[in-house]
Amino acid sequence: LVPHLGDREKRDSVCPQGKYIHPQNNSICCTKCHKGTYLYNDCPGPGQDTDCRECESGSFTASENHLRHCLSCSKCRKEMGQVEISSCTVDRDTVCGCRKNQYRHYWSENLFQCFNCSLCLNGTVHLSCQEKQNTVCTCHAGFFLRENECVSCSNCKKSLECTKLCLPQIENVKGTEDSGTT
């Protein structure tokens, strides 16, 4: 089976790398525009220059292209706690990230929110907080992990998963009480 190519890929595949086929004349291969620029006018003929113009402020192209317009720079999302790591340039989009001691949680492929790294109070750090993953905590005896926080076993209800984790502790307490009565 021959893989299906889109119109643009079909047109580009006829020309050598770094060139694209003229949209009005498929016998002409024009040189692509460098990153940071966009296509203003196709080359008039073989061996002649493509008219590329630099992207305007607030726009960019990150690779060689024959785009008629530059891409709009991304904005960091304040409502998601994002901060600007590096600003947009003509050849690179804005880079957004999180503050120190925060991690990114991706709600979808291109949407992340910044959250504070867990401190593992009443527990110990099993795995340190990373750029895209919260701290992994291990809880001290008498505590269980709920939504990445160590919660006292006194808050453990019978119906919850924590009963397995808290049961030895509860039995321990009962055992101590029993031994004290004899």
């Epitope: 999302r77 304040k78 409502e79 998601m80 709600w107 929110q113 959250f115 504070n116 919260n134 939504e147």
Partner: nanobody
């Protein structure tokens, strides 16, 4: 007590429109960015759209961009989702929620409103 009541769902033909509403109470609505998420049959939760506190900054998933519009009326404590050019793949239960703050989980939910797109 936080309450979120979604409404406006229903059966609609492909290409049709619906307007979902979410009436909020029990918290200071105007202080919270708000989110629409959806759950298609047999699928996980998908982010649809969100809006900042004042209604200026919005975000849309690629799959709904140009077709859906999120808005809010802080005087009425209500969030909206205008859905146009509906497709079969938009069929889902739609939920509204305040944007999570402490961690990647939704602490408050409504009961959701079912949107079915079918001919």
């Amino acid at each position: 007590e936080v309450q979120l009541l979604e409404s406006g769902g229903g059966l609609v033909q492909p290409g049709g429109s619906l307007r979902l509403s979410c009436a909020a109470s029990g918290f200071t609505f105007a202080h919270e960015p708000m989110v629409w998420v959806r759950q298609a049959p047999g699928k996980g939760l998908g982010w649809v759209s969100h809006i900042d506190r004042v209604g200026q900054d919005t975000y849309y998933a690629d799959s709904v961009k140009g077709r859906f519009t999120i808005s809010r009326d802080n005087s009425k404590n209500t969030l909206y989702l205008q859905m146009n050019s509906l497709r079969a793949e938009d069929t889902a239960v739609y939920y509204c929620a305040p944007l999570p703050k402490r961690g990647p989980r939704f602490d408050y939910w409504g009961q959701g409103t079912l949107v079915t797109v079918s001919s």
